[in-house]
């Protein structure tokens, strides 16, 4: 074991020593705008080149029936770009709000801007002075002050302004040592909200031309988030160029430009008023619920994902990468008969039930389009959302056989709060049983009605209670046929967990 550990350490040292010598970067202060033109990117290294070659080969040899797409039938799953033909331009001092479905490529977009992910095609322009706030807040061992200044020269006025805008004054005043209180190893432990605010403060304190804020308000309550968005993002940073990944309507309304991503493509780019004019059905769906912004981030993302899936299927969105033919949104009768009523109606079910998890697939796998009939998926909310989500959400997606398994597994992961990282998707695991509860039907609030909206066209009867065995049947798959695919989500989780 020691020998293997030593080898690992030697390899890491070797990798480090072989890297390009670090040089302090210069900045182009004459570049004021941030531009992205026709950007397409793959997470798999070198995949862009491979894809181009395959495309060329495809042009050279036509298939027997003249259908080019057949050549890509097995290729497209692994070759789906994480970003496809993305365009935007924002001037200095503007706020671009980036929203979109789960796994749509929002974080990947920021990675591309930072140069962490190299596109296979396109153009990116900015001054180079970037500050990034990750959705995963982090703290270094040291004082609060050190964690915020983080090596940047100290400016009292700037520091105080940032502390105030990020609502850290009250937290700091509680400690005898004030902002000299030590965090991390041997120090105090912070709450998730405090960590999030310190991480945001760190990003804001650094002087930059472009601020990339990746869902920075994690763990913050609705009121605090609203206040910090106003005081920090809108006021303190008013003259800075900002790109904010968000799922809040309030943020979209306040943004100068909006970019909505769906499955790696740009579903919409423009202003909020243009969104209302050009995509009235889509925007009214999301704004139809006054309490949309009161939902948890997970719930908002889920609703956004469902809505985008629905509208892209109805042909409102740009054609997806594999250019699937439009299919009816209505569910086939055959599918309704295949599933027992107990699965389709969890509303009356008050009792707890268990779900056997068969495989530890990661959530948010690439979703592939397919010509198979659409199926409705049972999607249950996690325990943490019981208060606001009594009804299960029904998600409508177009999936190939491979992704049916993924989507089912992601539902299981959602139900069981499962976070199994870095495991092989082929491995047959020992079944682990977790308990999930469905809250009883109380009075139907606007939230409940809203959660039904997406499935109002469905012709399914809602009755009985959930039968555990029936549910297990829904999620059974032959895992042998699934190819291994590493997505950005998996990669990001991996580096987050193993960052030491």
């Amino acid at each position: 074991q020691t020998w293997y550990d030593s080898l690992g350490a030697i390899n890491k040292i070797q990798d480090f020593l072989q890297k390009q010598e670090y040089k302090t970067l210069e900045y182009n202060l004459t570049t004021t705008e941030v531009v992205m033109e026709n950007v397409t990117a793959f997470w798999e290294e070198g995949f862009g080149e491979l894809f181009e070659k395959a495309k060329q080969n495809n042009n050279n040899r036509k298939t027997s029936n003249g259908d080019d797409s057949l050549f890509f039938s097995n290729f497209s799953l692994l070759g789906t770009p994480v970003l496809k033909d993305i365009n935007f331009k924002i001037e200095r001092g503007q706020l671009l709000a980036v929203a979109g479905s789960t796994g749509a490529g929002k974080t990947s977009l920021l990675m591309v801007i930072m140069g962490e992910l190299e596109p296979s095609e396109g153009k990116i322009k900015h001054s180079g002075r970037i500050s990034f706030c990750s959705q995963f807040s982090w703290i270094m061992p040291g004082t609060i002050k050190e964690n915020i200044i983080f090596g940047v020269s100290y400016d009292e006025y700037r520091y105080r302004s940032v502390i105030k805008a990020c609502q850290l004054e009250e937290d700091i005043s509680k400690f005898a040592e004030k902002d000299n209180i030590v965090l991390g190893e041997g120090g105090i432990t912070l709450s998730g909200g405090q960590r999030a605010r310190i991480s945001l403060a760190r990003a804001v304190y650094k002087d930059a031309d472009l601020y990339l804020l990746d869902s920075p308000f994690g763990y913050l309550d609705v009121l605090t988030e609203k206040e910090i968005f106003e005081s920090c993002v809108c006021k303190l940073m008013a003259n800075k160029t900002r790109i904010l990944v968000t799922s809040k309507m309030e943020h979209l309304k306040k943004a100068d430009k909006i970019l909505i991503l769906h499955e790696g493509s740009s579903y919409f780019y423009g202003t909020f008023s243009e969104l209302q004019n050009l995509q009235p059905d889509f925007s009214s769906k999301l704004m139809g619920c006054d309490s949309f912004d009161q939902f948890s981030a997970e719930r908002r993302n889920s609703i956004l994902t469902e809505t985008l899936h629905r509208f892209s299927l109805e042909g409102d969105a740009p054609v997806s990468w594999t250019e699937t033919k439009k299919q009816s949104f209505k569910q086939t009768g055959e599918f309704g008969e295949k599933r027992k009523n107990s699965i389709l109606n969890p509303i009356n079910s008050i009792r707890k039930f268990s779900i056997v998890q068969k495989t530890p697939l990661q959530m948010n796998g690439i979703e592939e389009d397919s010509d198979e009939p659409l199926e409705r998926r049972l999607s249950l909310v996690p325990d943490s959302e019981q208060g606001e989500a009594i009804l299960p959400r029904i998600s409508v997606i177009s999936t190939g056989p491979t992704l049916q398994a993924r989507r089912r597994q992601s539902v299981l992961n959602l139900m069981t709060h499962s976070v199994n990282q870095g495991q092989n998707i082929h491995r047959k695991t020992t079944a682990s049983t977790r308990k999930v509860s469905l809250a009883p039907q109380a009075n139907l609030t606007e939230l409940d009605i809203y959660s039904r909206r997406l499935s109002q066209e469905t012709g399914l009867e809602i009755s009985e209670e959930i039968n555990e065995e029936d549910l297990k049947e829904c999620f059974f798959d032959d895992m042998e046929s699934i190819p291994a695919v590493t997505t950005w989500n998996t990669y990001l989780r991996y580096i987050t967990v193993h960052k030491s």
């Epitope: 210069e26 033109e37 190299e118 596109p119 153009k123 900015h126």
Partner: nanobody
Framework: QVQLQESGGGLVQPGGSLRLSCATS????????IGWFRQAPGKEREGVSC????????NYADSVKGRFTIYRDIVKNTIYLQMNSLKPEDTAAYYC????????????????????WGQGTQVTVSS
């Protein structure tokens, strides 16, 4: 204004090698893209190779893949184009171009994407 200065051109026999240099400055070498283009007599200017200077990632035209190598020296602020196995059809005036944007894929081999150009250096491959 970005300054670009090419050098290293000359007369070489088929199968021989040459190394072209493009000296630049400032930001371009950190966040932009440097491209090499060539123009043979009576022909249009075409993209040969390019490099994203922040990451060192590269692209090549099909006609030079495996023979030409573009690389950078961040200390000397210089981009090099190492040309091996030269053929008579490689005879052309070679130009260094720069842009403050990062250009990827086919974008970085397109002339119209570049804002700054050098004066050019002549390469002649002949026996």
């Amino acid at each position: 204004q970005v300054q670009l200065q090419e050098s290293g051109g000359g007369l070489v026999q088929p199968g021989g090698s040459l190394r072209l240099s493009c000296a630049t400055s400032r930001f371009t070498l950190d966040y932009g893209t440097i491209g090499w283009f060539r123009q043979a007599p009576g022909k249009e200017r075409e993209g040969v190779s390019c490099i994203r200077t922040s990451s060192g990632s590269t692209n090549y035209a099909d006609s030079v893949k495996g023979r030409f190598t573009i690389y950078r020296d961040i200390v000397k602020n210089t981009i090099y184009l190492q040309m091996n196995s030269l053929k008579p059809e490689d005879t052309a005036a070679y130009y260094c171009a720069a842009d403050e944007a990062r250009l990827y894929g086919s974008s970085c081999l397109r002339m119209d994407e570049y804002d700054y150009w050098g004066q050019g250096t002549q390469v002649t491959v002949s026996s």
